[in-house]
């Protein structure tokens, strides 16, 4: 059918509560495109009827709520004027009772469910709520070890729990609960978060600076080997991770089988005020499918990308 396949990372989700996934893939979805969701390679699209438990809402697939049997691979097909991309998303649903067990044993929990507070600082936790505009969210309540959090040190502000003067006792199992209203019906969203405490200053308001790349394209011949450095300056005491991603997935995971594109070993040079970090990405052999994809260097909250481009033909 001429659609290019793109495989996203697995999503591990809790049953009996709402879940939504947005089919966005810059730069594909930035122009005039149509998006259609399918389940398990079915030829029949996911319903767009808002009363359906599972339905497409603009570019989103929305589960109201998600059920144990909804596990599987979902595809969203993005069709442009002269392009077609099929994005595969593997959703794994588990039964979870947050107050019965620790969430530490869950496989591959994303960063949204593992968060860090910095000892002795004022810091915050975030309740990640990703839903389309048709879903009205709130109010948010926060729990620690299944007891509602109260007290002068804690303030709920937007989707965050502000924690002043973080102490070692603040580590543990948290949950944020929000009421989601959709078409007059109410649902409960409950996200468990494992919180650890670090003594390193880390995110002290300083944001890592990506010196290179600078959101640009690189001309490279098909079949050649390419190495691109990501150069980042950051504070000496930072706790930020630096990595290369494609399609929101670590390149080493994305190209796990072929190992054609790999992330290098990080190195750093220490200066008096800051560190300069370098982590490269190696394309052993540039293939046609690499062109036009944003390869993203991430450093904490900072990102920058390169896009590979075929050199313009030389008519000399």
């Amino acid at each position: 059918d001429g659609c290019k396949d793109i495989f996203m990372k697995n999503e591990i989700l809790s049953a009996s509560q709402p879940f939504a996934f947005n089919c966005t893939f810059p730069p594909i979805t930035s122009g005039e495109v149509s998006v259609t969701w399918y389940k398990n390679s079915s030829k029949i699209p996911v319903s767009k009827i808002i009363q359906s438990r599972i339905h497409q809402d603009e570019t989103w697939i929305l589960f109201l709520p998600m059920e144990w049997g909804d596990s599987g691979v979902y595809q969203c097909v993005i069709k442009g004027r002269d392009s077609c991309h099929r994005i595969h998303v593997n959703l794994t649903v588990f039964e979870k009772h947050w107050c019965d067990t620790s969430i530490g044993g869950l496989p591959n929990l994303s960063d949204e469910y593992k968060q860090i507070l910095h000892l002795g600082k004022d810091d915050s936790l975030t309740c990640h709520l990703h839903f389309p505009k048709s879903c009205v969210l709130g109010p948010i309540k926060w729990y620690k070890d299944c007891n509602e959090i109260k007290g002068e040190r804690f303030t709920v502000l937007e989707t965050r729990l502000l924690v002043s003067n973080v102490s070692a006792e603040d580590r543990g199992n948290y949950a944020c609960q929000a009421i989601l209203t959709h078409s007059g019906k109410q649902y409960e969203v409950l996200n468990g978060i494992t919180v650890s405490i670090t003594e390193r200053a880390g995110y002290g308001g300083s944001v890592p600076k990506i010196i290179y790349p600078k959101n640009h394209s690189i001309e490279v011949q098909l079949g050649t080997t390419l190495i691109v450095d990501c150069n980042v300056t950051d504070t000496k005491d930072n706790t930020n991770l630096r990595c290369w991603r494609v399609n929101n997935t670590l390149v080493d995971d994305y190209y796990d089988e072929s190992k054609r594109i790999r992330e290098g070993v990080e190195t750093h040079v220490s200066f008096r005020e800051h560190n300069l970090y370098t982590v490269n990405i190696t394309f052993l052999e540039v293939k046609m499918e690499d062109y036009g994809l944003p390869f993203m260097c991430h450093a904490g909250v900072s990102t920058a990308y390169i896009i590979l481009q075929l050199p313009a033909p030389d008519f000399r």
């Epitope: 975030t126 937007e158 300083s206």
Partner: antibody, heavy 120, light 112 residues
């Protein structure tokens, strides 16, 4: 639609107290913090604090912590802000304000303002 | 407390022309959750302020699309693509990364 209606202008003597009310309608009163922001004549905006109408959370700007009390009357969906030990520099328009939604900040809804004049 | 500094203090603009206001915060407002807790307000003469932009670049409900917000963690810009007579007033930037919430000193925009 969301509406915040404040009490009328007040003239007070230095050392006195003033209590400004803000009556809310058009939404679930107990779901949202009520914020108070003041603006001295020809000056900028200054956040005073916020109060949750369930009554158990007040967060004040340290500048006002000894002089401001926030209370509510749930039966009438009204929040009150009392400022004590008034001085001439407290002359200002006092606004109550509510956030855009429960998960998005920024004050999308404001009262019309209450002018408090402190003069001997 | 986070200090918000606005420039210029005042601005005189010809109708139909673009305008730009800047604001700088003393601390990065970009949270590690990738949200920037930064806002723009407009206070028209004799009225309470109105929200224009939330979380740095999102247009508040009912705000004309001639307004746009952009920035980094500490440096922010409000652009008006074509100024209209109704855009006069004082523009304020604000942060709600942390308490106390703080506002910039304001930029007065008037029509030439």
């Amino acid at each position: 639609q969301v509406q915040l209606v404040q009490s009328g202008a007040e003239v007070k003597k230095p050392g006195a107290s003033v209590k400004v009310s803000c009556k809310a309608s058009g939404y679930t009163f107990t779901n949202y913090y009520m914020n108070w922001v003041r603006q001295a004549p020809r000056q900028g905006l200054e956040w005073m604090g916020m109060f949750h109408p369930t009554g158990d959370v007040t967060r004040l700007n340290q500048k006002f912590k000894d002089r401001v009390t926030m209370t509510r009357d749930t039966s009438t969906s009204t929040v009150y802000m009392e400022l004590s030990s008034l001085r001439s520099e407290d002359t200002a328009v006092y606004y109550c304000a509510r956030t855009t939604s429960m998960i998005i900040g920024g004050f999308a809804y404001w009262g019309q303002g209450t002018l408090v004049t402190v003069s001997s | 407390d986070i200090v918000m500094t606005q420039t210029p203090l005042s601005l005189s603009v010809t109708p139909g022309q673009p305008a730009s206001i800047s604001c700088r915060s003393s601390k990065s407002l970009l949270h590690r959750n990738a949200i920037t807790y930064f806002y723009w307000y407009l206070q028209k003469p004799g009225q309470p302020p109105q929200l224009l932009i939330y979380q740095m670049s999102n247009l508040a409900s009912g705000v004309p699309d001639r307004f746009s917000g952009s920035g980094s963690g500490t440096d922010f810009t409000l652009k008006i693509s074509r100024v209209e007579a109704e855009d006069v007033g004082v523009y304020y930037c604000a942060q709600n990364l942390e308490l106390p919430l703080t506002f910039g000193g304001g930029t007065k925009v008037e029509i030439k």
